[in-house]
């Protein structure tokens, strides 16, 4: 026996004293353990385990399945094992035909031997079909035969173990080897919505998608800042081999305004870990935001167009959208549509175009939206910039001459002195009196300015132009002065357009 | 050619030492456990001892008649075994047998011719 | 120790007979039992291991039978190099002993 120290414990001895014995099908397994200390026999083989706490295991008569390693143990925890092959002609192999395979790992296909003492122990394809080239093994008659680094393309390879007995090869039940995948990426994860816009008391369901090649991916739904475990519901799928596919639902039936916050769906694997965030707000009631994309006070000149423009934000989704003016609701030339086609768009545009503005269209015209929840309405004061227009040029009975004048901005009246037939009036002439007739009436369209002066400063025979101007342009009347004795005659008055 | 052969044997005062070897060719030595095995002139044989392989660690046996006195070794890499024979008696004359153990069962498949150790003053 | 048993210590018999002999463990060695036959000056041969399986070489005309205590070796038709004195043995438990042998010589 090897060398042991008095007083230390050794392992149990085993008679026969062998390592490996062959016995014959139908013999008894007779073995005996020596040890003061004796405690158990233990049987293994596959994932079979027997014990017997006899310090002789007697198996009457032998059978295939009695092949396997038998061990003694004693009180101190030490062993000794034999391994006990039964030679059965008829039955060469024990087999567990489940055979599972981790990428790019070693997996064992069960089929230890009855007879270790047969030849050429492999494995062959089935059908007479060859293995892939690559597939490398090594054979163990006691646990069968490793693949060594098992490929995905070996993925449902139909395979026997085999040995030759007597000269004649002879095939194990068939073993269909089911590869693992390994990971070798993150999972790829995506959300239903990557918002949400939620009623207090409105169902919040959001779906988290997650695609790995096995479901041995592990997801959850977390809410950030928050250890609460969140209700979730799956719905998988395999779509192939390696295409496996998730569907993680989080539902919370009766949304309340503190559930507001961001989700975040996480998933990880092996390789690492990936995540996807929604957020979900939740308002006590609907909303509508309107934003001018313009000033709300527009000035255009006479003639041009003009677009009213808004964006606004409406939750729920907008029922009821109008363009009114003096009252009067605008059936063409208004579109409203949303700012994106996204599926949780709440931003909603809406343009009004105005064309060829006339003078007298300058006024409010309002916006006015609604949903379920509420109204809302936004106003655009127009002002139209007309050129002055002389409406009246006179000489009163007493003397005064008289120019009234109407147009947007307020018009400035000039007026000017031409001696004789001379046709640039140079010398200014101050009014004796400027009036704004129209400043207290409707607040938008044209605007007349009354300016009068006394004719009876003029000596001589000339002309006396009133020149009226805004921003937009200009428009002048001429007073035509002759002198006959002592009386002054108003000739022809005309007015002259200067761009 | 599987066989063994056995020397070293020879005559030998009672109380001195013998050694014997017994080397091994045509198969693998060391997947084998070794014994020796002795026939007295004229009598039956005799089991002396064993000693197991690497998978047995090497454990030895051997019979009440031998043990303390004799030591059995082996060499796996000269594909010898040895017995180591010390303080001999007359009663130790015998022809010493070196014998094979097949792999998977306690018989002696394969044996030496034989060495005679002759111990007499 | 087991003891052997072996009986007859010898037997006459002639070519062509059948040949009969036993052997007595003093414990059951359920098959742990092996059967030898030995010429003078020469090693002995392995016949018959586990109590019945033949070593590879040896002719059908050798068998072994019993287990547990009790066991035979037959030789079914002797021939005239069966002449040889026959050595059971147990390999149950070291020490593992031999019968003190059967001689079998020619009547």
């Known amino acids: 026996q090897p060398s042991v120290s008095p007083g230390e414990p050794s392992p149990p001895s085993i008679h026969p004293a062998k390592s490996e014995l062959i016995v014959r099908v139908g013999n008894e397994i007779r073995l005996l353990c020596i040890d003061p200390g004796f405690v158990k026999w233990t049987f293994e083989i596959l994932d079979e385990t027997n014990e017997n706490k006899q310090n002789e295991w007697i198996t009457e008569k032998a059978e295939a399945t009695n092949t396997g390693k038998y061990t003694c143990t004693n009180k101190h925890g030490l062993s000794s094992s034999i391994y006990v092959f039964v030679r059965d002609p008829a039955k060469l192999f024990l087999v567990d035909r489940s055979l599972y395979g981790k990428e790019d790992n070693d997996t064992l296909v069960r089929c230890p031997l009855t007879d270790p003492e047969v030849t050429s122990y492999s494995l062959k394809g089935c059908q007479g079909k060859p293995l892939p080239k690559d597939l490398r093994f090594v054979p163990d008659p006691k646990a069968g035969i490793t693949i060594k680094s098992v490929k995905r393309a070996y993925h449902r390879l139909c395979l026997h173990c085999s040995a030759d007995q007597e000269g004649k090869s002879v095939l194990s039940d068939k073993f269909i080897l089911k590869v693992r995948p390994a990971f070798k990426a993150v999972p790829v994860v995506s959300v239903s919505k990557a918002s949400y816009l939620l009623r207090e008391g409105e169902e919040f369901t959001v779906t988290c998608t997650i695609k790995d090649v096995s479901s041995s991916v592990y997801s959850t739904w977390k809410r950030e800042n928050s250890q609460t475990k969140l209700q979730e519901k799956y719905n998988s799928w395999h779509h192939g081999d390696f295409n496996y596919e998730r569907q993680a639902t989080l539902t919370i039936s009766s949304a309340r305004v503190n559930d507001s916050g961001v989700f975040m769906c996480y998933a990880n694997n092996t390789f690492g870990s990936a995540n996807v965030t929604t957020t979900l707000e939740v308002v006590d009631k609907g909303f509508i935001n309107i934003f001018p994309m313009i000033n709300t006070t527009v000035f255009v000149n006479d003639g041009e167009n003009v677009d009213l423009i808004v964006e606004y934000e409406a939750f729920p989704k907008p029922e009821h959208q109008q363009w009114i003016y003096m009252n009067r609701t605008f059936t063409d030339k208004w579109e409203d549509y949303p700012k994106s086609e996204n599926e949780s768009n709440i931003r909603y545009v809406s343009e009004l175009h105005l064309t060829r503005l006339k003078g007298t269209e300058g006024g409010t015209y309002t916006f006015l939206v609604s949903n379920s929840d509420v109204n809302a309405s936004i106003a655009f004061n127009v002002y139209v910039n007309t050129k002055p227009e002389i409406l009246t040029y006179d000489r009163l009975v007493n003397g005064m001459l008289q120019c009234v004048a109407a147009g947007f901005p307020e018009p400035t009246i000039d007026w000017y002195f031409c001696p004789g037939t001379e046709q640039r009036c140079s010398a200014s002439v101050l009014p004796v009196d400027v009036q704004t007739l129209n400043a207290s009436g409707p607040p938008f369209g044209k605007l007349v300015v009354q300016s009068s002066i006394d004719s009876s400063a003029f000596k001589h025979n000339g002309t006396v132009e009133c020149k009226a101007y805004n921003d937009v342009g200009k428009t002048s009347a001429y007073f035509n002065f002759a002198f006959k004795g002592n009386n002054k005659e108003q000739i022809h008055p005309h007015t002259l357009f200067t761009p | 050619e599987v066989q063994l052969v056995e020397s070293g044997g020879g005559l030998v005062q009672p109380g001195r030492s013998l050694r014997l070897s017994c080397t091994a060719s045509?198969?693998?030595?060391?997947?084998?456990?070794m014994n020796w095995v002795r026939q007295a002139p004229g009598k039956g044989l005799e089991w002396v001892g064993r000693?197991?392989?690497?998978?047995?660690?090497?454990?030895?046996e051997y019979a009440a008649s031998v043990k303390g006195r004799f030591t059995i070794s082996r060499d796996d890499s000269k594909n010898s075994l040895y017995l180591q024979m010390n303080s001999l008696k007359t009663e130790d004359t015998a022809v010493y047998y070196c014998?094979?153990?097949?792999?998977?069962?306690?018989?002696?498949?394969?044996w030496g011719r034989g060495t005679l150790v002759t111990v007499s003053s | 120790d087991i003891q052997m048993t072996q009986s007859p210590s010898s037997l006459s018999a002639s070519v062509g007979d059948r040949v009969t002999i036993t052997c007595r463990a003093s414990?059951?060695?359920?098959?742990?039992l092996n059967w030898y036959q030995q010429k003078p000056g020469k090693a002995p041969k392995l016949l018959i291991y586990?109590?019945?399986s033949l070593q590879s070489g040896v002719p059908s005309r050798f068998s072994g039978s019993g287990s547990g205590t009790d066991f035979t070796l037959t030789i079914s038709s002797l021939q005239p190099e069966d002449f040889a004195t026959y050595y059971c043995?147990?390999?149950?438990?070291?020490?593992?002993?031999f019968g003190g042998g059967t001689k079998v010589e020619i009547k």
């Open positions: 000693t197991r392989n690497a998978a047995g660690s090497y454990t030895t």
């Open positions: 043995q147990q390999s149950y438990i070291a020490p593992y002993t």
């Open positions: 586990a109590a019945s």
């Open positions: 045509g198969f693998t030595f060391s997947d084998h456990d």
């Open positions: 014998a094979r153990e097949p792999k998977y069962w306690i018989d002696f498949d394969l």
């Open positions: 414990q059951s060695i359920s098959s742990y």
